[in-house]
């Protein structure tokens, strides 16, 4: 089970353009909070360690997933060609 948590913004930092959110999940051993089908989910911890983000199936069904350069995140390509980017910090 997972819930989305919005992190308090650090007032010492300039306004970030990407919301600082994380998923709080109760996961089994060997799993960790991630994203599956655009929703928070428990995923295999090895995916996070190896940064093979697309193995989480983070995009919606019918969308294509690609890793960003340096595996800093992933993109989801919608059937019509719009691309959504998620970076991992």
């Amino acid at each position: 089970t997972c819930e989305i948590v919005t992190l308090d913004r650090d007032s010492s930092q300039p306004r970030r353009t990407i919301a600082r959110q994380t998923a709080r999940c109760a996961c089994r051993k060997g799993q960790i909070a991630g994203t599956t089908r655009a929703r928070p989910a428990c995923v295999d911890a090895r995916i996070i360690k190896t940064k093979q983000w697309c193995d989480m199936l983070p995009c919606l069904e019918g969308e294509g997933c690609d890793l960003l350069i340096n595996r800093s995140g992933w993109t989801c390509t919608q059937p019509g060609g719009r691309i959504k980017t998620t970076t991992v910090s």
Epitope: I18, I69, T75, G80, I83, T85
Partner: antibody, heavy 114, light 113 residues
């Protein structure tokens, strides 16, 4: 700090072709798409088109044929407008288009008048 | 034709009050939730308030709340402040293959009494 700045807006006569440039910093155009939006004086926002990070452009139905969006470098996206009319007088904005449009540039004013 | 209808076109509210703005799409937005809300003040570019129908953008006050899915969406501003005087726009995302990728509502002007 992620930023976008538009340039190229000026006073032109009807029928002119004009190219606006959106220069980005603080993020990579290889990772994010950009939309162009315009706003006529005292009016609402009107979406013109979008270019994905794979160089694939999409246009509003009313903008197809007369407007062209292209990536011209690793930090710039151009909006080419042909056969301008007085109806095209507006402030033109570019914005990073991802989960919502954010951030936006300050805009550049295009005035079409004879 | 793709259309986002915003109501009302203008609204007045007293400081401390609550304002509700509605946005209706002529067809379902992508994934039923790809709708954003913006605040724009004169002479400034729009500022993202909410994306994915209900997710608050970074640095935005929790007084702003988005809700809805499919074709019907609502922006609620609670404990209205003088600084909230602005025009508010909804923006829907649609499948680029079947329609325009994006469309904006006509805007709602908020006046503080």
């Amino acid at each position: 700090q992620e930023q976008l700045v538009e340039s190229g807006g000026r006073l032109v006569t009807p029928g002119t072709t004009l190219t606006l440039t959106c220069t980005v910093s603080g993020f990579s155009l290889s990772s994010y798409g950009v939309s162009w939006v315009r706003q006529a004086p005292g009016k609402g926002l009107e979406w013109i088109g979008y270019i994905a990070n794979n160089y694939n452009p999409h246009y509003a139905s009313w903008a197809k044929g007369r407007f062209t969006i292209s990536k011209t470098s690793s930090t710039t996206v151009d909006l080419k407008m042909t056969s301008l009319t007085t109806e095209d007088t507006a402030t033109y904005f570019c914005a990073r288009d991802n989960y919502g449009m954010d951030p936006w540039g300050p805009g550049t004013l295009v005035t079409v008048s004879s | 034709e793709l259309d986002l209808t915003q109501t009302p076109s203008s609204v007045s509210a007293a400081v401390g009050g609550t304002v509700t703005i509605n946005c209706q799409a002529s067809q379902s937005v992508y994934n039923n939730k790809n709708l954003a809300w913006y605040q724009q003040k004169p002479g400034q570019p729009p500022k993202l308030l909410i994306y994915a129908a209900s997710t608050l953008a970074s640095g935005v006050s929790s007084r702003f709340k988005g809700s809805g899915s499919g074709t019907q969406f609502t922006l609620t501003i609670s404990d209205v402040q003088c600084d909230d005087a602005a025009t508010y726009y909804c923006q829907g995302e649609f499948s680029c293959s079947s329609a325009d990728c994006n469309a904006f509502g006509g805007g709602t002007e908020l006046e503080i009494l």
